[in-house]
């Protein structure tokens, strides 16, 4: 089970993303913002340091539809 904040790498990271994002799918990197000018991916944010559920969800491909 996913803990509130932990390090996720490799297949474990992929499995968790698939669980969190479901049918929406996910991507490993987001476009760089105008502020940072650099892209940073889920690998850096979750394998190289602890990440939480909210951060994982930002890598889901499309927003979940509200009921």
């Amino acid at each position: 089970a996913y803990r509130p904040s932990e390090t996720l790498c490799g297949g474990e990271l992929v499995d968790t993303l698939q669980f969190v994002c479901g049918d929406r799918g996910f991507y490993f990197s987001r476009p760089a913002s105008r502020v940072s000018r650099r892209s940073r991916g889920i690998v850096e944010e979750c394998c190289f340091r602890s990440c939480d559920l909210a951060l994982l969800e930002t890598y889901c491909a499309t927003p979940a539809k509200s009921e």
């Epitope: 390090t7 790498c9 490799g10 297949g11 474990e12 990271l13 992929v14 490993f28 990197s29 650099r38 892209s39 940073r40 991916g41 690998v43 850096e44 394998c47 190289f48 340091r49 602890s50």
Partner: antibody, heavy 119, light 111 residues
């Protein structure tokens, strides 16, 4: 247990492209993160780049314009290409693996291969 | 000049305790990125010694330990032995460079 073996020419001419291959045994290339690191003679370690089997890559900004890391899953190999080399690229080149059990630490390394850039 | 700063050399007598520091900044260690330590014996490839700031891979003696506080980390070696003589490197991720970074390395001499 994953094992890595680097291979490639030991001598490359200036302005040419350095090409190295890392052969993976004891594990699938479709499971982990794969890195290249180099060490110039008598100096410290320098990270070149890494990739995740999904195709996600990240390169050292100082080398980014010259570096390509690619994978051949059918041969369980990944490779490094460094273009327009100079004498400053002379180094021992290591491939390494992050299996994911070590929080991003590179827990498996090849023995290294020495590349000299000289005409 | 490395992004992560280590002392070029440290030394100690057999049985003593030595520490090696690794000083970073708010864009790497201070940003919460894990610190890893590697041991490189003469003429060999680096070996992962400490991962995730303070964890030892299997096979690494408990004489080796790591810690992290703020923007720096340190490696401690107790009960120093002759075969601990090696180069030691810290490694982390830097968000400003958007890449992995190594310290410049520290040569440990056992007197």
């Amino acid at each position: 247990q994953v094992q890595l073996q680097e291979s490639g020419p030991g001598l490359v001419k200036p302005s040419e492209t350095l090409s190295l291959t890392c052969t993976v045994s004891g594990g699938s290339i479709s499971s982990y993160y794969w890195s290249w690191i180099r060490q110039p003679p008598g100096k410290g370690l320098e990270w070149i780049g890494y990739f995740f089997y999904s195709g996600y890559t990240n390169y050292n900004p100082s080398l980014k314009s010259r570096v390509t890391i690619s994978v051949d899953t059918s041969k369980n190999q990944f490779s490094l290409k460094l273009s327009s080399v100079t004498a400053a690229d002379t180094a021992v080149y290591y491939c390494a693996c992050i299996t994911g059990t070590t929080k991003g630490g590179m827990d498996v390394w090849g023995q290294g291969t020495t590349v000299t850039v000289s005409s | 000049q490395s992004v992560l700063t280590q002392p070029p050399s440290v030394s100690g007598a057999p049985g003593q305790r030595v520490t090696i520091s690794c000083t970073g900044s708010s864009s790497n260690i201070g940003a919460g990125y894990d610190v890893h330590w590697y041991q490189q014996l003469p003429g060999t490839a680096p070996k992962l010694l400490i991962y995730g700031n303070n964890n030892r891979p299997s096979g690494v003696p408990d004489r080796f330990s790591g810690s992290k506080s703020g923007t720096s980390a340190s490696l401690a070696i107790t009960g120093l032995q002759a075969d601990d003589e090696a180069d030691y490197y810290c490694q982390s991720f830097d968000s400003s460079l958007s890449g992995s970074v190594f310290g410049g390395g520290t040569k440990l001499t056992v007197l």
